[in-house]
Amino acid sequence: AGVFELQIHSFGPGPGPGAPRSPCSARLPCRLFFRVCLKPGLSEEAAESPCALGAALSARGPVYTEQPGAPAPDLPLPDGLLQVPFRDAWPGTFSFIIETWREELGDQIGGPAWSLLARVAGRRRLAAGGPWARDIQRAGAWELRFSYRARCEPPAVGTACTRLCRPRSAPSRCGPGLRPCAPLEDECEAPLVCRAGCSPEHGFCEQPGECRCLEGWTGPLCTVPVSTSSCLSPRGPSSATTGCLVPGPGPCDGNPCANGGSCSETPRSFECTCPRGFYGLRCEVSGVTCADGPCFNGGLCVGGADPDSAYICHCPPGFQGSNCEKRVDRCSLQPCRNGGLCLDLGHALRCRCRAGFAGPRCEHDLDDCAGRACANGGTCVEGGGAHRCSCALGFGGRDCRERADPCAARPCAHGGRCYAHFSGLVCACAPGYMGARCEFPVHPDGASALPAAPPGLRPGDPQRYL
C-alpha cells in the first residue's frame, strides 16, 4: 500500500503567441481546482475509462478576480498535495489525467458553475520511494507545471511497495535470508506482504496480499480458531466449558478496516469509519464517489454498475464525458434541413430557416404561392423559397398592385421620346435612329442595320414596344 502524491506548481499561459484570456473577471470571479485520475500500465485509455488506480480532487484555490487590461497571470492555486492512496502494489508504469477546473463564483443562487479549463494526460514509469519527478504539460494555450511521486506506507517498502520492513529483533543482524531495509538500516526486510491484518502467528502467505491459515485457524485474517465442538459464547469459543481451542476474538481484533479506517463493534458485527477517499465495508475501495461531487453541468451522480466504477454521471442533453464536462456540439450533426442555420442555445437547439421553409428542423417546404394573389392579371411564380409575381403589362411591384410608368426608366435610346401607351410604351426616335428602343442607327444610304423594316413602317416612324 502507498500514496501517489501530486504537487501543482503553476497553471498559467504557456510561452509563445496567443496568450489565453484570464478565465476570471471582475464580473465573474472564480477559483481553480484540480482532478487527477490514475490508471495502471501505459495503455492509451479513454478519459472516460475508470480511474482504476484511484482519483483525487484538490481543494478549491483562492478566489481570483482579473485585473482589467492585465494579461492572464499564473493563477492562484489550491493549498496542499493531491493524494491518491493505492491499496495494492504500485504498478511502476501508469497513465495519468490531470484536469484543471474553473469554479465561477458569480451571483448564481443555485450554486457555482463549473467548467473544464484544461486537461493534460501522459504515461510514465515511476518507482515508488524515488524522488519527486518534475513535469510540464501544455493544453492549448495553457501550461501546467507539477511534480509527482509514489511513496509506500509503512511497513511496506520497495519500488512496488510489496516488501515489508520490521524493526530488528536482534540488535546486530537480520534473520536468515533477510536483508536490512535501505535506507532504514535499523529495520529488516520481511519476506512478503501478506493481506493487511493477517495474523503473524496463525497466518502466512505465498503471494502478496493473501492470508492462508495454519491448521486450527480460520477467518479472512486467520484470527478465528476452529472449534472442536459447538461454541456457545457469542464472542467465540471458551475453552473450559465447550472444548473449543482458545478464546475467540472480538470482531475488531486485527482491525479489519483497511486504509486507516477505524473499527467499532456493532451488535451483529463491526463497522468501519473510513477516511476521506475510501469507502466500502472495510474501507477497501478507493477513489472518487458521488459524495465528492464529480458531476458537472447538471449531471446527476449515481453508483456505478460494477465494483470498479464508483460513480456514473447521468448527463443532461447537451453534455457528455465521464463527468458531463464536455459540451456536445449538436450542430455538428447538421440537424437543420434545407440550408437552415443551426443555433445551439445550451438548453435547446434552434434552426433558423431560410425563406420558404419552416418547422423545428426547417423540414417543411412552404408553398410559396399558397394564399398569394398577384393583382391585375399577374401570375405567381415559385422559386428559391420565395414567391414572385410576373406582372401584366402596365403593372409592377411585389403583388402587381402598382401601376407602372413604362417611361420612368427612360427606355428610348439616342434621344428618342417615350410615350406611355395602353399596351406598354412607344418610342418616337430622333432622326437617324430606329428600332423599338431607337437602338439602331439608320445608315446614310437608307439601309438600316435591321434585316428589314416591318411592313407598313418607314424608318423614322415611332416604333411600338410590344
Epitope: G110, G111, V285, T289, A291, G298, C301, V302, C313, P316
Partner: antibody
Framework: QVQLVQSGAEVKKPGASVKVSCKAS????????ITWVRQAPGQGLEWMGD????????NNNEKFRNRVTMTRDTSTSTVYMELSSLRSEDTAVYYC??????????????WGQGTLVTVSS | EIVMTQSPATLSVSPGERATLSCRAS??????LHWYQQKPGQAPRLLIK???QSISGIPARFSGSGSGTEFTLTISSLQSEDFAVYYC?????????FGGGTKLEIK
C-alpha cells in the same frame, strides 16, 4: 430564500387525471433538477421521477412511466406533474423537491409543502 | 430495485438519551445514502447526505455512519423537537427508494 410552493388539494374520480404545480423561487430555477415524491396516508415515501428544467429531460420511476408526465415552464419557474388514469391507491400527498444537483449530488434539500390528491368515486 | 429496510419501526427513548436508528439496503449502495426527518403534517427535511456529510442548519447532535448495506443515524442527546419519523434514502441506482421509516417517540 429557497421556496417551493405547490398548488392546492384536489379531489378526483377514478380514471381522471390530476395536474399538480410547483413554483420555485430563491435560486436559479434552471440549474437544479426537481423531483416528485408521494406519500400515501400513514405510509412511507415513494419516488416518482425528476425533471431538469433547463432542457425538460426527465427520469421516471418505471412504476409510473406510462401515467406520469412532468413538464416545466421556465418563464414562470414552475414545474408540473400530471398523473393520469387515477385509482384509489393514488390517494396521497404529492411533494416536489429541489435536488442539490451541484456536483451531481442526488439529494433533496428543499421540499414543497405537499399537495393532497384524493381519488374517490 | 433496491429495498431499504429500517429498524426498529418504532423507537422509544427519553429526552437527553442517545438514539440509534438503523437502515439496511438489500444490496450495496456504496455511500449513496441520505437521511430525512419528517414531522406530522410537514414535508421531509434533509438531515445527512452521503452517509455522514452534515447539512448546514442541522444540529451537530445528528450524525451518520456505515457503508455498503448497513447504515446508522445517531442522535447523541435527544431534544423534544427530535421526536419525529426518520427515513433513509438511497441514490445509488434507479428507482430511488426510501426506507419505511422509524418513528422516534418519547419514552
Amino acid at each position: 430564500q429557497v421556496q417551493l410552493v405547490q398548488s392546492g388539494a384536489e379531489v378526483k374520480k377514478p380514471g381522471a387525471s390530476v395536474k399538480v404545480s410547483c413554483k420555485a423561487s430563491g435560486y436559479t430555477f434552471t440549474s437544479h433538477w426537481i423531483t416528485w415524491v408521494r406519500q400515501a396516508p400513514g405510509q412511507g415515501l415513494e419516488w416518482m421521477g425528476d425533471i431538469y428544467p433547463i432542457s425538460g429531460s426527465t427520469n421516471n420511476n418505471e412504476k409510473f412511466r406510462n401515467r406520469v408526465t412532468m413538464t416545466r415552464d421556465t418563464s414562470t419557474s414552475t414545474v408540473y406533474m400530471e398523473l393520469s388514469s387515477l385509482r384509489s391507491e393514488d390517494t396521497a400527498v404529492y411533494y416536489c423537491a429541489k435536488i442539490i444537483t451541484v456536483g451531481g449530488a442526488y439529494v433533496m434539500d428543499y421540499w414543497g409543502q405537499g399537495t393532497l390528491v384524493t381519488v374517490s368515486s | 430495485e433496491i429495498v431499504m429496510t429500517q429498524s426498529p419501526a418504532t423507537l422509544s427513548v427519553s429526552p437527553g438519551e442517545r438514539a440509534t436508528l438503523s437502515c439496511r439496503a438489500s444490496q450495496s449502495v456504496r455511500n449513496n445514502l441520505h437521511w430525512y426527518q419528517q414531522k406530522p403534517g410537514q414535508a421531509p427535511r434533509l438531515l445527512i447526505k452521503y452517509v455522514s456529510q452534515s447539512i448546514s442548519g442541522i444540529p451537530a447532535r445528528f450524525s451518520g455512519s456505515g457503508s455498503g448495506t448497513e447504515f446508522t443515524l445517531t442522535i447523541s442527546s435527544l431534544q423534544s423537537e427530535d421526536f419525529a419519523v426518520y427515513y433513509c434514502q438511497q441514490s445509488n441506482s434507479w428507482p430511488l427508494t426510501f426506507g419505511g421509516g422509524t418513528k422516534l417517540e418519547i419514552k
